[in-house]
């Protein structure tokens, strides 16, 4: 039960995270005008990865796309790339994880295959989350650098003769959405990797040893517990149903090759 819950929760958390990454990537408010120097501005500027917007006193908002590719800063291109890679990996991860879910049956898919798929999707979610966090952090760093540069220009430029306030930008809502979404995707991926450990059945045959009281001969019985454990060679990687009310997860799981991922 715990494995299914962990896997299901990991899937849901990752799904929310990837939805958040997509939302953040599409949002226009990656950077918003800093109102510290002009809190009463009638013209409010904000920018996204794809376009910049201006909200005017009439309440009308005009957005203009960045129609140039070569004229854009390399950092912005890098952020775009990181976010897109994050979305693509996350989407593939979601697709893979749907088929890996324990509660969904697809033909006679073996547990080892589901475990592998769970691990794959988990890793994809982790990388996707890291891409989003990296993208948002690079953009945030760019904002901080530009903020202090424009602050320096504000106080040194023009010798204070003309009151021209340079527009400074601060963190927009999209950055926080991106950080949270990236974190959720990362957590979801870790949960999928943890769930993978409990999914994979044991591949080793356990040798049973019978101990007798002193003075009697010791008999070694290879494969002695095959019938009772259900992990003999004839039932390898197959689920055992004993007619009881137990759920699949209550069948004891043993250490496997996925233990030390």
């Amino acid at each position: 039960m715990a494995v299914t819950a962990c896997q299901g929760l990991g899937f849901v958390v990752s799904l929310i995270g990837i939805a958040g990454i997509i939302a953040a990537t599409c949002m226009d408010q990656w950077s918003t005008q800093d109102l510290y120097n002009n809190p009463v501005t009638a013209v409010f500027n904000y920018q996204g990865l794809w376009r910049s917007c201006v909200r005017e006193s009439s309440g009308f908002t005009e957005c203009r796309g960045y129609f140039t590719l070569l004229g854009l800063p390399a950092m912005l291109q890098a952020v775009r790339a990181l976010m897109i890679v994050g979305i693509v990996l996350g989407a593939i991860g979601l697709l893979v994880s749907i088929f890996a879910l324990k509660c969904i049956r697809i033909g006679s898919m073996e547990d080892s295959a589901k475990a592998n798929m769970t691990l794959t999707s988990g890793i994809m979610f982790i990388v996707s989350g890291l891409c989003a966090i990296a993208g948002v952090s690079v953009f945030a760093n760019m904002l901080v650098t530009n903020f202090w540069m424009s602050t320096a220009n504000m106080y040194t430029g023009m010798g204070g003769m003309v009151q021209t306030v340079q527009t400074r930008y601060t963190f927009g809502a999209a950055l926080f959405v991106g950080w949270v979404a990236g974190g959720l995707t990362l957590i979801g991926g870790v949960m999928m990797c943890i769930a993978c450990r409990g999914l994979a059945p044991e591949e080793t045959n356990y040798k049973a040893v019978s101990y007798h009281a002193s003075g009697h001969s010791v008999a070694y019985k290879p494969g002695g517990f095959k019938a009772s454990t259900g992990f003999g060679s004839n039932t390898k990687n197959k689920k055992i149903y004993d007619g009881g009310a137990r759920t699949e997860d209550e069948v004891q799981s043993y250490p496997s090759k996925h233990d030390y991922v």
Partner: antibody, heavy 115, light 113 residues
Framework: EVQLQQSGPELVRPGASVKMSCKAS????????MHWVKQSHGKSLEWIGY????????SYNQKFKGKATLTVNKSSSTAYMELRSLTSEDSAVYYC????????WGTGTTVTVSS | DIVMTQSPSSLTVTAGEKVTMSCKSS????????????LTWYQQKPGQPPKLLIY???TRESGVPDRFTGSGSGTDFTLTISSVQAEDLAVYFC?????????FGAGTKLELK
């Protein structure tokens, strides 16, 4: 055609209040802020404030805080401005203004404060 | 508050003459976000509400004759009427649309000789 039809002239006593209306037509009322401007006789224009018809959010000129109150009725596409504690200084023509670049002006409401 | 100073306060002209009026703001009205100057020009005739002529300092409103031209950037702006017509006799106001409170100039009154 975008139009702003304002209520008729008002003659009020000093200390009283007045509430004027501005009915919008020809555009989506919630698309633009509604601004109010005062024009005293033979004088320039003074911005009073604006209201966002979507959420009722307002911004006032410090000079008119406590004097003017802006409200809207979305269902009837009408904006209202109430002026209280009127004095002779408040005698003026009041305009509502909207759309992009504040291009459309109302017909104007003349308020005369006299005892 | 941004102070808008218009000059001259009145102008006496003859039909067909070229007219220039000035508007200065105490702070820059330039918005780096979209590279626009948020200065608007209005024309007001007696008994009528103001009419929008020019926005963004130099963009003519649709329906406005091309004899009206706006220019300038930052803090200094100009409205030019290339050839004054009788129907142009009115008061012209400039307005700061960049910062609250929105402020207007005192106006330039155009009169016929």
């Amino acid at each position: 055609e975008v139009q702003l039809q304002q209520s008729g002239p008002e003659l009020v006593r000093p200390g009283a209040s007045v509430k004027m209306s501005c009915k919008a037509s020809g555009y989506t009322f919630t698309d633009y802020n509604m601004h109010w401007v005062k024009q005293s006789h033979g004088k320039s224009l003074e911005w009073i404030g604006y209201i966002n018809p979507n959420n009722g959010g307002t911004s006032y000129n410090q000079k008119f805080k406590g004097k003017a109150t802006l409200t809207v009725n979305k269902s009837s596409s009408t904006a209202y401005m109430e002026l209280r504690s009127l004095t002779s200084e408040d005698s003026a023509v009041y305009y509502c203004v909207t759309t992009r670049y504040l291009a459309v002006w109302g017909t104007g409401t003349t308020v005369t404060v006299s005892s | 508050d941004i102070v808008m100073t218009q000059s001259p306060s009145s102008l006496t002209v003859t039909a067909g003459e070229k007219v220039t009026m000035s508007c200065k703001s105490s702070q820059s009205l330039f918005n780096s976000g979209n590279q626009k100057n948020y200065l608007t020009w209005y024309q007001q005739k007696p008994g009528q509400p103001p009419k929008l002529l020019i926005y963004w300092a130099s963009t003519r409103e649709s329906g406005v004759p091309d004899r009206f031209t706006g220019s300038g950037s930052g803090t200094d702006f100009t409205l030019t009427i290339s050839s004054v017509q009788a129907e142009d006799l009115a008061v012209y106001f400039c307005q700061n649309d960049y910062s609250y409170p929105l402020t207007f100039g005192a106006g330039t009154k155009l009169e016929l000789k």
